[in-house]
């Protein structure tokens, strides 16, 4: 019987099994009973990343600098270009089609995780004993100054946004 199913990396056409084109190549013509599938390599700036029967290769992704994008990994005939964002920016989606400026952590919040090209800054509230008095994409919460270790006393309590104010100890007269 003519085949109704084909082996892996084959496809059924005209009651016969033809080889799929390998990654990096596109289909030119289906196989015949005498010759195998004709495939051609993808051109410059094109790719196909699977065994396929595509008649056109896909265009490599363009990393548009106007959108804050730059090339992280150049595409090949078998892989797409991977874009990432310029310093200080991160991708808005997994596909990284555009970039936004890294978020800064407001006073009272510190950086838990610094942003990368694909993820935004993660902020956390400064817990008791820590503060942040700046808006920053890099600064963590800082511990309050320890007045005791300086032989001083707390004159003004710290908050999540301000450090403690230390002063001299009252001397007995």
């Amino acid at each position: 019987e003519p085949p109704t199913a084909c082996r892996e990396k084959q496809y059924l056409i005209n009651s016969q099994c033809c080889s799929l084109c390998q990654p990096g190549q596109k289909l030119v013509s289906d196989c015949t009973e005498f010759t195998e599938t004709e495939c051609l390599p993808c051109g410059e700036s094109e790719f196909l990343d699977t065994w396929n029967r595509e008649t056109h290769c896909h265009q490599h992704k363009y990393c548009d600098p106007n959108l804050g994008l730059r090339v992280q990994q150049k595409g090949t005939s078998e892989t797409d270009t991977i874009c990432t964002c310029e310093e200080g920016w991160h991708c808005t989606s997994e596909a990284c089609e555009s970039c936004v400026l890294h978020r800064s952590c407001s006073p009272g919040f510190g950086v838990k995780q610094i942003a990368t090209g694909v993820s935004d800054t993660i902020c956390e509230p400064c817990p008791v004993g820590f503060f942040s008095n700046v808006s920053s994409a890099f600064e963590k919460c800082h511990p309050w100054t320890s007045c005791e270790t300086k032989d001083l006393v707390v004159q003004q309590a710290g908050t999540n946004k301000t450090d403690v104010v230390c002063g001299p100890q009252d001397r007995l007269r």
């Epitope: 019987e1 015949t32 009973e33 005498f34 010759t35 004709e38």
Partner: antibody
Framework: QVQLVESGGGLVQPGRSLRISCAGS????????MHWVRQAPGKGLEWVSG????????VYADSVKGRFTISRDNAKNSLYLQMNSLRAEDTALYYC????????????WGPGTTVTVSS | ETTLTQSPATLSLSPGERATLSCRAS??????LAWYQQKPGQAPRLLMY???SRATGIPDRFSGSGSGTDFTLTISRLEPEDFAVYYC?????????FGGGTKLEIK
């Protein structure tokens, strides 16, 4: 078992005709494309012609185009090669071969039949 | 027409040795290449297809590689029954073509 057997070879004068046959057994003959391949004495293999399962596609080597005709009768499990206007250079051992069912190489060959073109 | 050139024309080796046979195509045939073995007085026998796939019943000392224009048939350890003529054949385009053959003889 799967088998191909050629017949009909012999001595023939230049310019004359000859028809050789190939009988298949042990497989569904009509499910396979078939080929003729020849081998001149002391020489290598030369593909001559091929025919699809239902005879709708036929291909020939340039050296025999217009002189040789391939055909098949699936009901009789038979393949044929009609050779006209024979030349001395057609002298060879003629093999019939089956195209494999799951790839394009020739996986079963007959023992061959000898065609000698000489005056 | 795709021309296949086999080298060397003759290869003289001893049983137990490794044999490397080459087949070069005049244009790319992808991986659509077969290898056949022929012994005197016998019909050719299919060894490899699609460049690197062994045909049914072929021992694993035979292996094939290559794609595009350069192909190799390797016999890892020669057995006495391996001494024969080897042909490559492409099925990428019509006309189908065979290489001129490599004769593997006992040294």
């Amino acid at each position: 078992q799967v088998q191909l057997v050629e017949s009909g070879g012999g001595l023939v004068q230049p310019g004359r005709s000859l028809r050789i046959s190939c009988a298949g057994s042990g497989f569904t003959f009509g499910d396979s494309a078939m080929h003729w391949v020849r081998q001149a004495p002391g020489k290598g293999l030369e593909w001559v012609s091929g025919i699809s399962r239902n005879s709708d596609t036929i291909v020939y080597a340039d050296s025999v185009k217009g002189r040789f005709t391939i055909s098949r009768d699936n009901a009789k499990n038979s393949l044929y090669l009609q050779m006209n206007s024979l030349r001395a250079e057609d002298t060879a051992l003629y093999y019939c071969a089956r195209r494999s069912g799951d790839h394009h190489a020739m996986d079963v060959w007959g023992p061959g039949t000898t065609v000698t073109v000489s005056s | 027409e795709t021309t296949l050139t086999q080298s060397p024309a003759t290869l003289s080796l001893s049983p137990g040795e490794r044999a490397t046979l080459s087949c070069r195509a005049s244009q790319s045939v992808n991986t659509y290449l077969a290898w056949y073995q022929q012994k005197p007085g016998q019909a050719p026998r299919l060894l490899m297809y699609d460049s690197s796939s062994r045909a049914t019943g072929i021992p694993d000392r035979f292996s094939g590689s290559g794609s595009g224009t350069d192909f190799t048939l390797t016999i890892s350890r020669l057995e006495p029954e391996d001494f024969a003529v080897y042909y490559c054949q492409q099925y990428s385009t019509v006309p189908l073509t065979f290489g001129g053959g490599t004769k593997l003889e006992i040294k």
